[in-house]
């Protein structure tokens, strides 16, 4: 996260770190004790030995001895994510995957699931939401040792597809968030992590997973905001995948 | 809650887990009449509100549990239920003669559990 601040334990209890051979590569969000939602692009061909993945939860410091680490039983990625069929494909829609843990995490003060958007709940342009992660604090910088949080507004797809922004690269199942002048953004290593918005549509205030960190030009550049997978467009995919693949193991695809 | 953020038309009561659906024609909240499809309806209701799943469901009786500010019932069209993703598409106002309605506990989410929200 560029332009963010250190967060404290329990503020974002659904945030997890996806580690391959011990190195943090992506973020993820707990949907339950045993399911994590993340980005499909976190699982290219060269990183598919599931026994080498670990999911780290319940801590804000990457080096914390108090966090829990669990193995991965299965990864369900979206069948419409084209780069897995053709590594040079530039069509990066459907950048979404589910990780099924080898056993459930215990839910504690520091480990809690995030809500999904309610059916039919639309993103609100201009609404300020929060993105979190352990990614780089500068484009060419280092990863954060402590979980970072940053507040950024949702940008309409019309604006984000403008010539000065991303010129029609923002597809319907994506959205942008950030400031036109830049300065605050997700960055390398934040992929797959949560973009959450708080609302009270269920009477109790709750945080909902509105976006998954996906891509962008550089980090925190003017007129190049972060681009996110729009979770509301994948509600049914998530429910179906969890119902269908709860016993699966290995890399699984679902359209 | 701000004026721009109305309540979602499906709600679950924190008191007794009853499911309530807003009737926008009448401007009232209705209970969901119990049926053989309670498990599916509970699951669909929880999913619709943004919860991952229903953990349990049960039946309550309006005579003992009370209406608690609701007014009447919706019944589920069980024939259309398997083919829908939206509860609101398969319900209609009904009498619910037995007065038994659906309650569900959804998997909680999106809330910090700290003693003091920092």
């Amino acid at each position: 996260i560029v332009g963010g601040r250190d967060t404290s334990l329990g503020r974002w209890p659904w945030q997890v770190s996806l580690r391959y051979d011990g190195a943090h590569l992506c973020g993820g969000s707990l949907l339950s004790g045993d399911w994590v939602l993340t980005a499909a692009h976190c699982f290219p061909e060269r990183n598919r030995v599931l026994s080498r993945w670990r999911v780290f939860a319940g801590a804000v410091a990457q080096a914390s001895p108090h966090g829990l680490q669990l193995g991965v039983q299965a990864v369900v990625y979206h069948g419409g994510y084209l780069p897995f069929r053709d590594p040079n494909s530039e069509e990066n829609s459907n950048d979404i995957a589910l990780v099924h843990l080898s056993s459930p995490l215990p839910l504690t003060e520091y480990i809690q699931p995030v809500c999904l958007p309610a059916a039919g709940q639309a993103l609100v342009d201009g609404k300020i939401c929060t993105v979190t992660g352990w990614g780089n604090t500068q484009y060419y910088g280092q990863q954060a040792g402590v979980l970072q949080e940053a507040r950024v507004p949702i940008i309409s797809n019309d604006v984000c597809n403008g010539a000065d922004f991303y010129g029609n690269q923002i597809k319907p199942k994506m959205f942008c968030a950030g400031y036109p002048e830049g300065g605050i953004d997700a960055c390398q290593g934040d992929s797959g992590g949560p973009f959450v918005c708080e609302d009270s549509i269920s009477r109790t205030p709750r945080w909902r997973l509105c976006g998954i960190v996906s891509w962008g030009t550089g980090c925190a550049l003017a007129q190049k905001p972060g681009v996110y997978t729009k979770v509301s467009d994948f509600r049914e995919w998530i429910f179906q995948a969890i119902k269908t693949h709860s016993e699966a193991s290995g890399m699984v695809t679902q359209l | 809650r701000s004026d721009q953020e109305p309540l979602y038309p499906v709600q679950v009561s924190s008191a007794d887990a009853r499911l309530m659906v807003f009737d926008k024609t009448e401007g009232t909240w209705r209970l969901l009449c119990s049926s053989r499809s309670n498990a599916r309806v509970a699951g669909l209701s929880c999913e619709e509100m943004g919860f991952l799943r229903a953990l349990t469901h049960s039946e309550l009786d309006v005579r003992t549990a009370g209406a608690n500010g609701t007014s009447g019932f919706f019944c589920v069209d069980e024939g259309r239920l398997p083919h829908t993703q939206r509860l609101l598409e398969v319900i209609s106002v009904c009498d619910c003669p037995r007065g038994r309605f659906l309650a569900a506990i959804c998997q909680d989410c999106g809330r910090r559990k700290l003693p003091v929200d920092r």
Epitope: H24, S89, Q188, S191, L221 | -
Partner: antibody, heavy 130, light 107 residues
């Protein structure tokens, strides 16, 4: 507003040298690919060279490799094409163009993607003749 | 090297006609194909990228079938008489190659 302005063209003898400049404004130069594309009189478009200045990566067409050098000065938002050992067949209008780049935000070594040449300069004519 | 074979090299059409130009890549280029319009004495202008992104204006559209790429002008307008080029930018987005061009003339 995005603008690319080429300069430095002119008449040069075979074997001579010329340096073209492309002054860029209205976008983040460091994170864009800059390209030179040429068009011989009455002919089609031919790609010449590209640079991704953030990493300093440079790429050349076989026809100019070893003779032409692409470079960029990010402090001046300017791309250059140094052309040495010029030949008659290098006679063309030389266009400067840019393409946007993007990358995933995972912790892997990044692959930088681009999306076609979205802005072009007006072109500068290079004539190689004795 | 990847070759882009464009056809036809020229065509005559009337205002309102539907016009199709095709480009065949000598090997897989995924969807990394762009289409450009060039008018005499002017710089080329990007119409379509990623084979089938939305054209501006919307009467321009692109499609892909394997290694065959098509630019379609749904209803030719007077300002559309120009030369059109396809281009691939697949190989790590360098070694870019253009098709030979298609000149669209007034019938």
């Amino acid at each position: 507003e995005v603008q690319l302005v080429e300069s430095g063209g002119g008449l040069v003898q075979p074997g001579g040298s010329l340096r073209l400049s492309c002054a860029a404004s209205g976008f983040n130069f460091s994170y864009s690919y800059m390209h030179w594309v040429r068009q011989a009189p009455g002919k089609g478009l031919e790609w010449v060279a590209s640079i991704y200045s953030y990493y300093g990566s440079t790429y050349y067409a076989d026809s100019v490799k070893g003779r032409f050098t692409i470079s960029a000065d990010t402090s001046k938002n300017t791309a250059y094409l140094q052309m040495n050992s010029l030949r008659a067949e290098d006679t063309a209008v030389y266009y400067c163009a840019r393409s946007d780049s993007w990358s995933y935000k995972s912790g892997y070594t990044q692959k930088i993607y681009s999306k076609g040449l979205d802005y072009w300069g007006q072109g500068t004519l290079v004539t190689v003749s004795s | 090297d990847i070759q882009m074979t464009q056809s036809p090299s020229s065509l005559s059409a009337s205002v309102g006609d539907r016009v199709t130009i095709t480009c065949r890549a000598s090997q897989s280029v995924s969807s990394a194909v762009a289409w450009y319009q060039q008018k005499p004495g002017k710089a080329p202008k990007l119409l379509i990228y990623s084979a089938s992104s939305k054209g501006v204006p919307s009467r321009f559209s692109g499609s892909r079938s394997g290694t065959d790429f098509t630019l379609t002008i749904s209803s030719l307008q007077p300002e559309d008489f120009a030369t059109y080029y396809c281009q691939q930018y697949y190989s790590s987005y360098y070694l870019l190659t253009f098709g030979q061009g298609t000149k669209v003339e007034i019938k």
